[in-house]
Structures are given as structure tokens and as C-alpha cells.
């Protein structure tokens, strides 16, 4: 057992390491641990096959740590790991898109407030186990085409705080199993109509605190399983191009937040849900 | 900072219902993991209920079953516990807590509703 | 209770008190561990069974063997004195299940 750290067997082969200051991964982990817990050191760089041995892991806390570099291979060999923490590593700021390529047992994988400004093409490939993706309080810009196709098990989808400016007509195909998707707190100024096609399962949709004037009801056409919208803090503008989206929040059976409208002058601040459909005109 | 505010203290007849409230403030309903957890006087911790990820769906303990309903509204960061045909013995303090990590653990707690049941 | 905890420990300020959990199925589950203040809510203090809380003092630690898990508080003060829970996510029955509890005094 290192010597920063705590080895026991039941009840489950656990290495535990965290606030230990430790400066990089510790040698000489079990090759046996099935839980290692590294988090709050001052790790920066998590070199290839830093685990290899480690054929058993299911659980690798690597978070609030000082990670500015992955090595591409570092998670080789982990076929059995089921929850991964990389959160609170602000100076990592990018991933190698064949990180977690062969971990096809993950179920939760942490990369909140990592500093992440893209995700690469095919960075989730082949994760068809994943169920929560934790991605907030980064500084995305964009959603690229298919970038989480292969997630077909994911439950919670969080991607919230980050700088998101539009969600594009691919961003979220293939999420089949999707129960909640967080995008508040962005720059979302444009939702493409078919950008929700396949979210047939979709409960939760938090749209609030970003930059939308206007969104299309094809979008929300989809959302059959929908009970739970937020649109507030947005600049809605209320003349007749907001018709459709009124039709279809009075139709609408689940709980939704308000809709306040900024423009034009005359309704500013009142609940685009509360209005009658002759006070949305002018175009 | 994560908090939870639960709705205050209420004295119901036996046979009755009662609704408890906990809100989230400081991060929403959407990203905790919500559970339910009750404490009679000069007793111990009792899990009633909760949300279990791995399913997706709440589950209870058996004790409570067919008793308790929880619902979320996610559209105002508010979840609910309703205690229907209440006993003398469910006179304790309602707890609300959340895992906010998906860590397996509780460690959000509300401050507590105390739920007296007299005739 | 499914767990079992002693009813009570008590020791004096300074020392190193230890307050076990077992029964159940504490042999195949993490523990966790809660501290209660009287008249407050619980607060989580270790989690898989020897992960402490952000912001929890290192006096507190937890520790395992095959069919337990032990919780010990070193350099015992005042502010200790609390009950405390042991808990594990039972799989068998989908549920929670708490031990139930132990309360520690400061001599």
C-alpha cells in the first residue's frame, strides 16, 4: 500500500489517498483495489496506463486535483470501471477524445468544472453504459454533431453554466433514454427545430437563464414524456411569432416556470402563459 | 450552497394526511438525488423513501408502502412527501435529504418539519 | 434496527473514543456515517466507509473489517457530544437501512 495512503479489503479492495497533498499517482496501488480515491491532492498530470494493473477498479476518484493533463491511454485496461470523478480540475481545459475509449462499464463519469472549452469528436464513443454525464460549470461554446450518439443508457445529461450559444439539429441524437437535460445558466440564443427528435423519454428540460427570444414548437414536439419546463430568464419577445409557443404551453399538462416577456415595451415582464392570444401581435 | 428548506411544523388528527414541502435553493431539484427520512422523539433514523438512479423510480420502504406518495416538481425545485392516514406513531420529525454527487450518500439534510398526530 | 450500534459511548476530553456498526448487511455494503447535534439535523461526515466530508476534521476517521465498520473520533472535545448514525444502501431490500445510533458523551 502507498505510503500516503489506506488499503483495506472489505468490502470492497480499496486504495483511499485524498488530502494527502500527493504531487502525482501514487506507485504501488493493489493491483486488486476495485475502489482508488485520489481526490484532493495536487495531482497535475495522470500519465498512461496509470492503472493498468488495476483490471478490477469500478470506482477512480481523481477530483479536486490540479489535473491539466490526461494521457490519451491513462484509463487503459479499466473495461470493469463504473464511476469515474475528474470534477474540480479547472486547468485541464481539454480531453483527448480516446480517453475513455474501452470503458464500457461506465455508468457515471464527473467532468464538471473542469475548465473544458470543446469536446472533442467521439470523446463518448462507445460508453453505451453511461447514465449520468456530468458536464457543468465549463466553458463549452458548442455542441458538435453526434457527440453523444452512443449513450443510449444515459438518464441525466448536465450542461448547465457553460457558454452554449445554440443547439444544433444533431447535438442530441441518439439520447433514446434521456430523463433530464439541464442546459440553464448558458448563451442559447437558437434551438433547432428538430434539435429534440429523439428525447421521447425526456421528463425534465431546464432551458432557463439564456439568451432565447423566440423557440420553435417543433422542437418541443418530441417531448411526449415531457412533466417539467423552465424558460425564464430569457428575452422572450412576445409579438405574433410567440403564437405557436403560446398554443403550445396551453396545451401543455406539465409544470412550467413562467415565460416573461421582455419586447415589446408594452408586456414587458408579463407571462407569456397568461396572455391572451390577440395581445401577441405585431411583427 | 446547497440548501433545504422544508415547510413548518403541522399537528393532524389521527386518519388524516399531511404534505411536507423541501425546497432547493443554491443548485436545483434536477441535479440531487431526493430521499425522505423520519426520526420519532428519542428515536433513531428511518429511511422512508426515495429516488434510486439505478431504476429511475422512487422507491419506499415496505412499512410505508401504499402510505407515502413523493412527487418533484422540478419546475420550482420543490420536492413532496405525503403521509396519508396518519397514526399516533408518526409523530416524529420529516427529514428531507439529497446525495447531490450520485456518490451513494445523503449529505444534504433538511432542518426538519415536525408532524404531530393527536386527537 | 438492522445495524447494530452500542446505545452509548462516553470518554474524556482528549481521548479516542471508537463506535462500531455491524449486522445486516454491513459485510457486502459501504457505510456511511452521520453526525447528529442535539436538536439539529443529521450532517454526513464519512462516506464509503473511510472518505471524509469536505470540511470535516481529520479526527473523525472510519475503518472496515470483513463483517463491521467502526467510526473513531480522536482528541475528544465538548462539541462532540452528539448521537451518531451508521447507514448502508441495502441492495437486498432497495432501501436504506440505519443503525440505531450511538450516543457519545464527553466526560
Known amino acids: 500500500c502507498p505510503g500516503a495512503c489506506v488499503c483495506y479489503n472489505e468490502p470492497k479492495v480499496t486504495t483511499s489517498c485524498p488530502q494527502q497533498g500527493l504531487q502525482a499517482v501514487p506507485v504501488g496501488i493493489p493491483a486488486a483495489s476495485q475502489r482508488i480515491f485520489l481526490h484532493g491532492n495536487r495531482i497535475s498530470h495522470v500519465p498512461a496506463a496509470s492503472f493498468r494493473a488495476c483490471r478490477n477498479l469500478t470506482i477512480l476518484w481523481l477530483h479536486s486535483n490540479v489535473l491539466a493533463r490526461i494521457d490519451a491511454a491513462a484509463f487503459t485496461g479499466l473495461a470493469l470501471l463504473e464511476q469515474l470523478d475528474l470534477s474540480d480540475n479547472a486547468q485541464l481545459r481539454s480531453v483527448d477524445p480516446a480517453t475513455f475509449h474501452g470503458l464500457g462499464r461506465l455508468h457515471t463519469l464527473h467532468l464538471d468544472r473542469c475548465g473544458l472549452q470543446e469536446l472533442g469528436p467521439g470523446l463518448f464513443r462507445g460508453l453505451a453504459a453511461l447514465q449520468y454525464l456530468y458536464l457543468q460549470d465549463n466553458a463549452l461554446q458548442a455542441l458538435p454533431d453526434d457527440t453523444f450518439r452512443d449513450l443510449g443508457n444515459l438518464t441525466h445529461l448536465f450542461l448547465h453554466g457553460n457558454r452554449i450559444s445554440s443547439v444544433p439539429e444533431r447535438a442530441f441524437r441518439g439520447l433514446h433514454s434521456l430523463d433530464r437535460l439541464l442546459l440553464h445558466q448558458n448563451r442559447v440564443a437558437h434551438v433547432h427545430p428538430h434539435a429534440f427528435r429523439d428525447l421521447g423519454r425526456l421528463m425534465t428540460l431546464y432551458l432557463f437563464a439564456n439568451n432565447l427570444s423566440a423557440l420553435p414548437t417543433e422542437a418541443l414536439a418530441p417531448l411526449r414524456a415531457l412533466q417539467y419546463l423552465r424558460l425564464n430568464d430569457n428575452p422572450w419577445v412576445c409579438d405574433c411569432r410567440a403564437r405557436p409557443l403560446w398554443a403550445w404551453l396551453q396545451k401543455f399538462r406539465g409544470s412550467s416556470s413562467e415565460v416573461p416577456c421582455s419586447l415589446p415595451q408594452r408586456l414587458a415582464g408579463r407571462d407569456l402563459k397568461r396572455l391572451a392570444a390577440n395581445d401577441l401581435q405585431g411583427c | 450552497e446547497v440548501q433545504l428548506v422544508e415547510s413548518g411544523a403541522e399537528v393532524k388528527k389521527p386518519g388524516a394526511s399531511v404534505k411536507v414541502s423541501c425546497k432547493v435553493s443554491?443548485?436545483?431539484?434536477?441535479?440531487?438525488?431526493m430521499h425522505w427520512v423520519r426520526q420519532a422523539p428519542g428515536n433513531g433514523l428511518e429511511w422512508m423513501g426515495g429516488?434510486?438512479?439505478?431504476?429511475?423510480?422512487?422507491k419506499h420502504a415496505q412499512k410505508f408502502q401504499g402510505r407515502v406518495t413523493m412527487t418533484e416538481d422540478t419546475s420550482t425545485d420543490t420536492a413532496y412527501m405525503e403521509l396519508s392516514s396518519l397514526r399516533s406513531e408518526d409523530t416524529a420529525v420529516y427529514y428531507c435529504?439529497?446525495?447531490?454527487?450520485?456518490?451513494?450518500?445523503?449529505?444534504?439534510w433538511g432542518k426538519g418539519t415536525l408532524v404531530t398526530v393527536s386527537s | 434496527y438492522v445495524l447494530t450500534q452500542p446505545p452509548s459511548v462516553s470518554e474524556a476530553p482528549g481521548q479516542r473514543v471508537t463506535i462500531s456498526c455491524s449486522g445486516g448487511n454491513v459485510g457486502s455494503s459501504s457505510v456511511n456515517w452521520y453526525q447528529q447535534l442535539p436538536g439539529k439535523a443529521p450532517t454526513l461526515l464519512i462516506y464509503?466507509?473511510?472518505v471524509l466530508t469536505s470540511g470535516v476534521s481529520a479526527r473523525f476517521s472510519g475503518s472496515r473489517s470483513a463483517t463491521s465498520a467502526s467510526l473513531a473520533i480522536s482528541g475528544l472535545q465538548s462539541e462532540d457530544e452528539a448521537d451518531y448514525y451508521c447507514a448502508i444502501w441495502d441492495d437486498s431490500l432497495n432501501a436504506w437501512v440505519f443503525g440505531g445510533g450511538t450516543q457519545l458523551t464527553v466526560l
Open positions: 435529504a439529497a446525495d447531490r454527487r450520485h456518490w451513494g450518500s445523503l449529505d444534504v
Open positions: 443554491g443548485d436545483t431539484l434536477a441535479e440531487l438525488t
Open positions: 464509503y466507509d473511510t
Open positions: 429516488y434510486d438512479p439505478e431504476s429511475g423510480e422512487t
